[in-house]
């Protein structure tokens, strides 16, 4: 996949940066916000931030602004500065009348099929699990392979170093074609196949990936708040796996909170299966210790760990999973569609 | 463009029987779960069912439960309430319902029970 | 079922002023499930918050949500000429979902 060039986005904030930098007015009020970032402590959710009247005043002049509405794109060149710059202007948009974070990412059009040829596994075993196809159709594509093999060393002997596991996490969950990404993490096992869930809860090798002792969820928050990535993948996935009901409605779409869920993976607040045994996810990170920030730490860890959107979407893509393989279907090429971006 | 458009509505006995149409355009209906939700003459809201994306999962408020079914067909991006043995008090405007972040409701067809 | 209760039943205010609904349940309510919504005469309703707290798309900064447990709060910092109108709390923690009877926000 070509990486999104600034110009298919609607409204990037590396242009809208660059025509801030041409207006004298624009300039001066965004590089002043950039400085009040030092007193204005990014608040949590159960905080109001305090705000020195300079820098309203700089925020209010930024509110005219393209910067304000500017976005970024999770596959973007330059994607880090992008997230700088839209989290400078979120103090503008904020400031004054606290908002809860909305996603940087603007969700772009995509048609084209992605095709899967599953005639090459016929080198498998008939019986094989799903989660052995997945690997094997991810090691029959170059790009897939490349992308795995490098997180893979990155991740493995008994001296792995965690943040370079993690980089390279990331970059095979940005890279790598999705189907080709979703298919190895969200493979479906047959309930009893311990093998499988075992292959498939290994897949984002946890014990390098991992803390090795769970943190506090309410610390692992305050870390991952601090690194724009990182606070832009958890905002993207709050806001499109939030539920909607106990049906499991999705705030937005199941699709989008699988790609939302994926692009968490490592960052800081990487989450994986819990069991061999079950498809239950979590953060590597505990409650304990909350003080009465524990109503507070508890949902947030519920967020992962019981969110009826997230369980139905991953579910969902499961089902979808299994019937790729089923017997009944036409020919052993077929085309997986992207999902079209949608209201 | 994006947009729910009800039909079915109309005058109808006690008694009687009627069947309300969604038709959904502009999205992918079958990603969401929809929902019926009615408006007495100048009363407030009331949720009367709401279906699964794929249609295996359906609830009802307890006034209509055993009377009214909800059901959609996929394929022509149509929601529906079958509504029998109507009552004077199901006299409703009802809207069928996207309740998602960018919400989409239908413009509300009005059923009247009388005789 | 889960009643929900508003108060107050109308609400009188001049632009510019700060609205507080309330919305109170008759049973413990996950927030998440928590939703309010905007209905102007003759029109279908809008939805304004999910979550207890989260702005639908679209919706100005002056709308907020807030409350956990049995009682929630809906507030407008402001009042603009536009926000007059019913306001309904919904709950979709539940089977039966339900409204709140609604409030009534009128110019005075």
């Known amino acids: 996949d070509p990486l999104p060039t600034e110009s298919r986005l609607m409204n990037s904030c590396l242009q809208a940066r660059r025509k801030c930098q041409a207006d004298p007015t624009c300039s001066a009020a965004y590089h002043h916000l950039d400085s009040c970032t030092s007193s204005i402590s990014t608040p949590l959710p159960s905080e109001e931030p305090s705000v020195p009247a300079d820098c309203l005043e700089a925020a209010q002049q930024l509110r005219n602004s393209s910067l304000i509405g500017c976005m970024c794109h999770r596959r973007m060149k330059n994607q880090v500065a992008c997230l700088d710059i839209y989290w400078t202007v979120h103090r503008a948009r904020s400031l004054g009348n606290y908002e809860l974070d909305v996603s940087p990412y603007e969700d772009t059009v995509t048609s084209k099929p992605w095709k899967m040829n599953l005639s090459k596994l016929n080198m498998l075993k008939p019986d094989s699990d799903l989660c052995l196809k997945f690997a094997m159709l991810c090691t029959l594509n170059d790009k897939c392979d490349r992308l795995r093999k490098a997180y893979g060393e990155a991740c493995s002997g008994p001296h792995c170093q965690r943040h370079v596991c993690l980089r390279q996490l990331l970059t095979f969950f940005e890279k790598a074609a999705e189907p080709h990404a979703q298919g190895l993490l969200l493979c479906p096992c047959a309930p009893n196949d311990r093998g499988c869930g075992e292959r498939r809860r290994n897949t984002i090798a946890p014990n390098c990936a991992l803390p090795p002792v769970a943190p506090n969820c309410l610390e692992l928050r305050r870390l991952c708040f601090s690194d724009p990535l990182c606070r832009s993948r958890l905002v993207d996935f709050q806001t499109h796996c939030h539920p909607m009901d106990i049906l499991g409605t999705c705030a937005t779409e199941q699709s989008r909170c699988l790609r939302a869920y994926l692009g968490l993976i490592g960052t800081a607040m990487t989450p994986n299966f819990v069991s061999n045994v079950n498809t239950s996810v979590a953060l590597s990170c505990t409650c304990r210790g909350s003080g009465n920030l524990q109503e507070e730490c508890e949902m947030l860890e519920g967020f992962f760990s019981h969110n009826p959107c997230l369980t139905e979407a991953i579910a969902a893509k499961m089902r979808f999973h299994s019937q790729l393989f089923s017997q009944d279907w036409p020919h052993p090429t077929f085309a997986v569609m992207a999902h079209q971006n949608e209201n | 463009q994006v947009q729910l458009v009800e039909s079915g509505g109309g005058l109808v006995q006690p008694g009687g029987s009627l069947r309300l149409s969604c038709a959904a355009s502009?999205?992918?209906?079958?990603?969401?779960?929809m929902h019926w939700v009615r408006q007495a003459p100048g009363k407030g809201l009331e949720w009367v069912s709401v279906?699964?994306?794929?249609?295996?999962?359906?609830y009802y408020a307890d006034s209509v439960k055993g009377r009214f079914t909800i059901s959609r067909d996929n394929s022509k991006n149509t929601l529906y309430l079958q509504m029998n043995s109507l009552r004077a008090e199901d006299t409703a405007v009802y809207y069928c319902?996207?309740?998602?972040?960018?919400?989409?409701w239908g413009q509300g067809t009005l059923v009247t029970v009388s005789s | 079922d889960i009643v929900l209760t508003q108060s107050p039943a109308t609400l009188s205010l001049s632009p510019g002023e700060r609205a507080t609904l309330s919305c109170r349940a008759s049973?413990?309510?996950?927030?998440?499930?928590l939703a309010w919504y905007q209905q102007k005469p003759g029109q279908a309703p809008r939805l304004l918050i999910y979550?207890?707290?989260n702005r639908a798309t679209g919706v100005p900064a002056r709308f907020s949500g807030s409350g956990s447990g049995t009682d929630f709060t809906l507030t407008i910092s402001s009042l603009e000429p536009e926000d007059f109108a019913t306001y309904y709390c919904?709950?979709?923690?539940?089977?039966?979902?339900?409204f709140g009877q609604g409030t009534k926000v009128e110019i005075k």
């Open positions: 319902a996207r309740i998602v972040r960018m919400d989409i």
């Open positions: 502009g999205f992918t209906f079958s990603n969401y779960t």
């Open positions: 279906i699964s994306y794929d249609g295996s999962s359906t």
């Open positions: 049973q413990s309510v996950n927030s998440h499930y």
């Open positions: 979550g207890a707290s």
């Open positions: 919904q709950q979709m923690d539940g089977f039966p979902f339900t």
